[in-house]
């Protein structure tokens, strides 16, 4: 007797109904940018404050005939799904209403920044507890408009948005482009990228994590006990909103960046059929389906990591691709990845105060990624040990030569166009887990950290024969933040972290034969934070 | 999520900087650039957010939004400020015709200029 | 199959808080798909609807009965209960406890009253 | 608040006839009405729903139309067991009654 979404985004011992509190989220705002709403409904009735704030482009024809009922349709249906007495996810918490879409479900990036510009005027003059910003709205790619959530962001607020119902890349539309909001894309029932007739669900780097989103019951705008299903992105963007709600009203001290490597935590992994996103993007989108966490109180004690992929290079031959971590993160380690192979590695850069993760494209490349492995470690200090190219044969290496500093990842970037395929592998040496190894023509990139309680330890697995994957995960207590491929193997295509798993690709075995550097080795780092467990611990 | 993503349609238009002979006329070598939606059909000609440098206060958008009234009214141009922006952004709305765009561009304390366009539920 | 009974006093005095519970059996309270409700109908009138409640305690009233009206939940006694203060006269009617549909579970049927409790006569006299 | 009137007050009809009643609204519900029949000394139950959708276990004779402000509810044989009052109610915005319809026997 529950709504199948409600279901899915509540950890699997819990009874939903009996987890979802019916204070659940009551020390947060939400604000909503979207139609006029209908705020006598039952479902939100004393929970959503409709606001002042009008800003909407006249409706388009003109024999447009305005219906009421119509005009708050898409509206009232999001402030249940966020807050809805029944079928809402943050069932305590409060709302607020902007319109910024017209009756015709149609608004302008000026309305919207607008709408922003009004909810921190909001924030200055009475600062409440947590602010949420729901936009469940898209346009193509704005830089105003994600200056503006950026803006908002930094002030402290957290922002989710829609991914987007083109079926395209959400990196090309606004402002789910924007890196500092939460964007999010749509399931359905069965896990798998909502379908929306000839289009659905945007894809690709730019989405954070999915959510319910097809044949979602919410409350209908056609009568006050009314419910209906609609399906979207912005019903999946409603569900995060409701759960980031209920997180932050568990821990209202949380950060954004802190938020957001929760709710990726907390997500469900490798349940979506990646079969349905265009190829070039299934290693780009994130397989990750929102939940709640499994308990109210907070996981302080965890070491958070996320992946952030880079936009592509282009195919110049002198072109780099750059992955950023948020400000809050540090860069824990760097990886790169090209699908043609053709890559010349990558290096981590001081950029503006700030590491950042530079992947290089080589001569005939379609182009490449970088890949940034990106972690909360508070009280870090991070920094970059580089070896330059080694004449001697056993290759280049590199490690923490720092006391109390561990090593919590690996890059290397060549000049030379292509390392040769004649040139064994190197191996790393055993007993020396603080170093990094590569190829005597490659500079190597050490990323060394000290942090309290931090340890880390190496774990390798090699294939002897080729494959077009090897993995390697980090165990349970442990989190993924270094992820690299030995050097020597001329086929890999590059390597990165999905969730707490190091991946190495390499060409397609067919094309490659089996000779002895078929060999494939993938190395991940492994991190535990002894310090954060024991805060944990002193709180509990 | 960078900037570079190349749908996105940027029109970078030159400054001339002996035009006008403004008086807070740009650092040397900084261009304010254009930037419009690249999905045509939600393209909004006519209305422009015009946004200013970090650290532009209210009072010197005012003023050059004002500024950019006048000099559009000595062209024959009407124009029309619908926002002044601040809190998050500085800058300010103008419906305007796209005529006026370079003249925009060379404004003092610029940094871009962006054509509205639509957005629409999800 | 489910039934409800309502039960309380059948007299109470003018300005005084008017008190009735409703024990529901043959199915549990616990449901997204139901709201509890009561609606009352004074001698030879019309039915209005009071108000409703969910098991978690969610409440929606009569605008018009909103400042007098409370309805709580007791979920492990499978019961809902009434309060009606400063009652006059006019509040004199048949009191009926009723489910109502929710609308949240599309299979739990149409967003209507029924079944009904068969209603308890509540006077408010001196 | 939205009014539902109903008419006539009471409605004299003989079994094995049709009876019409009818029941206005002072704004629109859109289809979001319902039909009560209360018998003496019970509640109410249920016939049509949503204007025009029969309850379970109502028979074919009774059916409900109209939409918007005004509906129509139709026993299209009267049987001695249909004699009781009817009511209507709406859900457009919250719940209201109608004032009843009384069918008596001629």
């Known amino acids: 007797s529950i709504p199948w979404n409600l279901e899915r985004i509540t950890p699997p011992r819990y009874r939903a109904d009996e987890y979802q509190p019916p204070d659940g989220g009551s020390l947060v705002e939400v604000y909503l940018l979207d139609t006029s709403i209908q705020s006598d409904h039952r479902e939100i009735e004393g929970r959503v404050m409709v606001t002042d704030f009008e800003n909407v482009p006249e409706e388009d024809g003109t024999r447009f005939h305005r219906q009421a009922s119509k005009c708050d349709s898409h509206g009232t249906h999001l402030a249940g799904v966020v807050s809805g007495r029944d079928a809402g996810v943050a069932k305590g918490a409060s709302m607020r209403s902007l319109r910024v879409l017209n009756c015709q479900g149609k608004g302008t990036v000026s309305g919207t920044l607008i709408g922003l510009e009004f909810i921190r005027k909001s924030q200055l003059v009475q600062p409440v507890g947590p602010l949420v910003v729901l936009l469940p709205l898209a346009g193509g790619y704005s830089r105003v408009l994600n200056a503006a959530c950026q803006r908002l962001a930094r002030a402290g607020v957290v922002l989710v948005t829609a991914a987007g119902n083109f079926r395209d890349d959400a990196c090309l539309y606004s402002p789910a482009s924007a890196p500092e909001v939460i964007t999010v894309g749509a399931t359905n029932a069965q896990d798998q990228p909502v379908t929306l007739g000839t289009l659905g669900t945007n894809f690709g780097r730019c989405v954070d994590l999915f959510a319910p989103g097809e044949d979602i019951i919410g409350a209908s705008s056609d009568c006050s006990t009314c419910f209906v299903s609609q399906s979207g992105t912005s019903q999946a963007a409603a569900h995060v909103a409701g759960i980031a709600a209920m997180m932050l009203s568990a821990e209202p001290e949380l950060t954004l960046a802190e938020l957001r490597q929760r709710l990726i935590h907390f997500s469900a992994k490798d349940v979506i059929n990646e079969a349905w996103f265009p190829e070039d993007q299934r290693v780009l989108t994130p397989n990750l389906v929102a939940a709640l966490p499994p308990s109210t109180h907070g996981a302080g004690w965890q070491l958070f990591c996320r992946t952030v992929w880079s936009a592509h290079s282009g195919p110049t031959r002198m072109a780099t691709a750059v992955a950023r971590c948020a400000p809050d993160e540090e860069l824990l380690s760097c990886s790169s990845f090209s699908r043609s192979g053709k890559r010349r590695g990558e290096r981590m850069e001081a950029q503006g105060g700030k590491l950042v993760c530079r992947a290089h494209n080589a001569f005939g490349g379609e182009g490449v990624y970088a890949i940034a492995r990106c972690c909360l470690l508070p009280q870090a200090n991070c920094s970059v040990h580089t070896a330059p190219p080694a004449e001697a044969s056993m290759g280049t290496r590199v490690h923490c030569h720092q006391q109390g500093h561990v090593l919590t990842g690996c890059s290397s970037h060549w000049e030379v166009e292509d390392l040769g395929t004649h040139k064994p592998p190197v191996l790393r040496p055993r007993g020396q887990p603080n170093q990094c190894v590569g190829h005597r023509e490659a500079s190597i990139h050490a990323s060394c950290c000290h942090a309290p309680g931090l340890e880390c330890k190496v774990k390798e697995h090699g294939i002897p024969a080729p494959q077009e994957q090897v993995t390697v995960a980090c165990e349970e207590g442990w989190t993924l933040t270094g992820c690299s491929a030995l050097p020597g193997t001329s086929h890999v295509l590059g390597a990165y972290a999905v969730d707490n798993t190091c991946v190495v690709r390499s060409r397609d075995v067919s094309t490659t034969g089996s000779t002895s550097e078929g060999a494939v080795t993938a190395v991940a780092i492994c991190c535990r934070s002894r310090h954060l467990a024991q805060a944990s611990q002193e709180l509990q | 999520q960078e900037d570079e993503d190349g749908d996105y349609e940027e029109l970078v238009l030159a400054l001339r900087s002996e035009e006008d002979g403004l008086a807070e006329a740009p650092e040397h070598g900084t261009t304010a650039t254009f930037h419009r939606c690249a999905k045509d059909p939600w393209r909004l000609p006519g209305t422009y957010v015009v946004v200013l440098k970090e650290e532009t206060h209210l009072s010197q958008s005012e003023r050059t939004a004002r500024r950019l009234q006048a000099q559009a009214a000595r062209r024959g141009y009407l124009t029309k400020i619908l926002h002044v922006f601040h809190g998050l952004l500085p800058g300010f709305l103008v419906k305007m015709s796209g005529d006026l765009l370079e003249l925009a561009l060379k404004l003092p304390h610029v940094d871009y200029i962006e054509e509205d366009s639509s957005v629409f539920a999800q | 199959q489910l039934q409800l009974q309502e039960s309380g006093p059948g007299l109470v005095k003018p300005s005084e808080t008017l008190s009735l519970t409703c024990t529901v059996s043959?199915?549990?309270?616990?449901?997204?798909?139901?709201?509890w409700g009561w609606i009352r109908q004074p001698p030879g009138k019309g039915l209005e609807w009071i108000g409703s409640i969910n098991y978690r305690g969610s409440t929606y009233y009569n605008p018009s009965l909103k400042s007098r009206v409370t309805i709580s939940v007791d979920t492990s006694k499978n019961q809902f209960s009434l309060k009606l203060s400063s009652v006059t006269a006019a509040d004199t009617a048949v009191y009926y406890c009723a489910r109502e549909n929710s609308g949240v579970v599309p299979a739990a049927g149409p967003n209507w009253f029924g079944p009904w409790g068969q209603g308890t006569l509540v006077t408010v006299s001196s | 608040e939205i009014v539902l009137t109903q008419s006539p007050a009471t409605l004299s009809l003989s079994p094995g006839e049709r009876a019409t009643l009818s029941c206005r609204a002072s704004?629109?519900?859109?289809?979001?009405l319902a039909w009560y029949q209360q018998k003496p000394g019970q509640a109410p139950r249920l016939l049509i729903y949503d204007a025009s959708n029969r309850a379970t276990g109502i028979p074919a004779r009774f059916s409900g139309s109209g939409s918007g402000t005004d509906f129509t509810l139709t026993i299209s044989s009267l049987e001695p067991e249909d004699f009781a009052v009817y009511y209507c109610q709406q859900r457009r915005n919250w719940f209201t009654f109608g004032g009843g319809t009384k069918v008596e026997i001629k």
């Open positions: 704004q629109s519900v859109s289809s979001y």
């Open positions: 043959g199915g549990s309270i616990r449901s997204s798909a139901y709201y």
